[in-house]
Interface confidence: low
Amino acid sequence: IWELKKDVYVVELDWYPDAPGEMVVLTCDTPEEDGITWTLDQSSEVLGSGKTLTIQVKEFGDAGQYTCHKGGEVLSHSLLLLHKKEDGIWSTDILKDQKEPKNKTFLRCEAKNYSGRFTCWWLTTISTDLTFSVKSSRGSSDPQGVTCGAATLSAERVRGDNKEYEYSVECQEDSACPAAEESLPIEVMVDAVHKLKYENYTSSFFIRDIIKPDPPKNLQLKPLKNSRQVEVSWEYPDTWSTPHSYFSLTFCVQVQGKSKREKKDRVFTDKTSATVICRKNASISVRAQDRYYSSSWSEWASVPCS
Amino acid sequence: RAVPGGSSPAWTQCQQLSQKLCTLAWSAHPLVGHMDLREEGDEETTNDVPHIQCGDGCDPQGLRDNSQFCLQRIHQGLIFYEKLLGSDIFTGEPSLLPDSPVGQLHASLLGLSQLLQPEGHHWETQQIPSLSPSQPWQRLLLRFKILRSLQAFVAVAARVFAHGAATLSP
């Protein structure tokens, strides 16, 4: 058993047939010594008396809010949550496996630049009685500070018969060094509580591996005289790291016809302009990627040819 | 060229070669980006590689103030990786595919280190750890880890030379 936060405790249980469970001793936080009784949740049934209560925690029916009272007055509470280990593996029931980039990916994170700011998100099908708490650090043995905000519900989607809820959190490394080569990964730890079930999820990454620039901005076409060619120009996204002479991007320019089956013409360039042939009913799209490190491409920015 | 006396390197040449190094490092092991090598054991094997750290002066401001600190650190790293790529880890079993870019990568590391430090000038270079894995599968894993770490190192080096070529060239 360990303390998650004030008056909230997590009991780690091997979820086995006939498992003896864990013996837990609760102590009433009061100077009082006599006349103390204990109850669980909303029930008025007295579970025991005295300053301490010893219970055998085996299943969810044994978890919940234990309250000690004296003469009708509440003295203190202890909330017991369960963390299940099933067949040797900690349960991961609350969050959905996003399966990208690999199986058992529950947390996904992205950064728009090298400033040390990043966003993580996760999915669940649970709509109520759900809380999350996020902590992060750079490295684990001698951790350096990363500050995370509160996790918020950022999207709701319908997937078949189910509703899916996306939560996200923003974090910022306290003393980020954008130009350095990272040697210690960022660690992100999410505590999830659904009703009386506790689970924890972790992710470990380098900022360089989760970089995904915003799409290029101000995408414009300039027709070239007496030619089917156009000059496409764009600018670095505002959110990208500066100076651009140091934090450089590379770009992919694509000409795509109306039909998905039409052949796509692609040009790769380090410049912020390119000359392409603009076909009727086609569109021109540009996306960006770090020039020197193959992290994710940005989403496309597009303009119609006409 | 970056010499102990402090003259400037051939920024544009260094920029071109370091960008080529980035391309080669990714083509040598493109899928490495999808493998979480930190989950595999053997952490100590790649902990000794020289990293370009915050105090090494490789940020735009540091380069403007005095690029020598940064260039020395980059040179140190290039020599380190050049030796690793020439070691038993890469030359031993299992053999590399004939068209593997590791050979080119090895040569380019040497080429860039020579651009930074011509014959007759010697910066202190870091000791290469004695990495001789007992099993071929350990060797493969080490290759992946070294290439992964090299990709991060050359990315920073390429940014340094690109910025230098754009802002510090005579």
């Epitope: 091997d14 979820w15 086995y16 006939d18 099933e86 029931d93 959905k96 099908t125 | -």
Partner: antibody, heavy 114, light 112 residues
């Protein structure tokens, strides 16, 4: 008393699919994972996969590469195991086993023959 | 996958005598929490397997105390102190330390 009752024996042709059911009683169905294990004649037991009935989350043995699908109907306290693209070597007794492997179904014999 | 190697394949025993079955794992099943994630089963002819021992040494409910489990992280043993006629069948070990869970090839216990 905990009981796992499986559907009856099946005979299938190669290439077909089979869906075996496992009805649970005597306990709260959503409190326990359900495993599926098979045993070909004279062979060792082979774990196929597991499902968490509460959330429908599954983990499969990669040996069955996309051929196995485990599902649940919580309202009926029933777990299902579907195996597709059947071949003769899939002839086996298929068992469901509750989390912890203390409780097993009686087994379902699936025969694959042309 | 973790490979479970069981010996012997066949074990003829006289009633009242002890019996010992060995199981070797290709990877340690002893985890940081101090538990060894190994089960032992008995499958009697025409029946489903029944759990005898879990977590290497804990007897399942209703299992007689003549059955005991022991071992290290990779070398595991099931002992029957005095074999009885009802103990005949095939004994299997199973690791549940990692997915996919894997079983030993089985040991057939027969009465001499």
């Amino acid at each position: 008393e905990v009981q796992l009752v499986q559907s009856g024996a099946e005979v299938k042709k190669p290439g077909a699919s089979v869906k075996v059911s496992c009805k649970a009683s005597g306990y709260s169905f959503t409190d326990h994972n359900m495993n599926w294990v098979r045993q070909a004649p004279g062979q060792r037991l082979e774990w196929m996969g597991v499902i968490n009935p509460n959330y429908g989350t599954t983990t499969y043995n990669q040996k069955f590469k996309g051929r196995v699908t485990i599902t649940v109907d919580t309202s009926a306290s029933t777990a299902y195991m579907e195996l597709s693209s059947l071949r003769s070597e899939d002839t086996a007794v298929y068992y469901c086993a509750r989390r912890g492997f203390a409780y097993w179904g009686q087994g379902t014999l699936v025969t694959v023959s042309s | 996958d973790i490979v479970m190697t069981q010996t012997p394949l066949s074990l003829p025993v006289t009633p009242g005598e002890p019996a010992s079955i060995s199981c070797r794992s290709s990877k340690s099943l002893l985890y940081k929490d101090g538990k060894t994630y190994l089960n032992w089963f008995l499958q009697k002819p025409g029946q489903s397997p029944q759990l005898l021992i879990y977590l290497m040494q804990t007897r399942a409910s209703g299992v007689p105390d003549r059955f005991s489990g022991s071992g290290s992280g990779t070398d595991l043993t099931l002992k029957i102190s005095r074999v009885e006629a009802e103990d005949v069948g095939v004994y299997y070990c199973q690791q549940i330390a990692e997915y996919p869970f894997t079983f030993g090839s089985g040991t057939k216990l027969e009465i001499k």
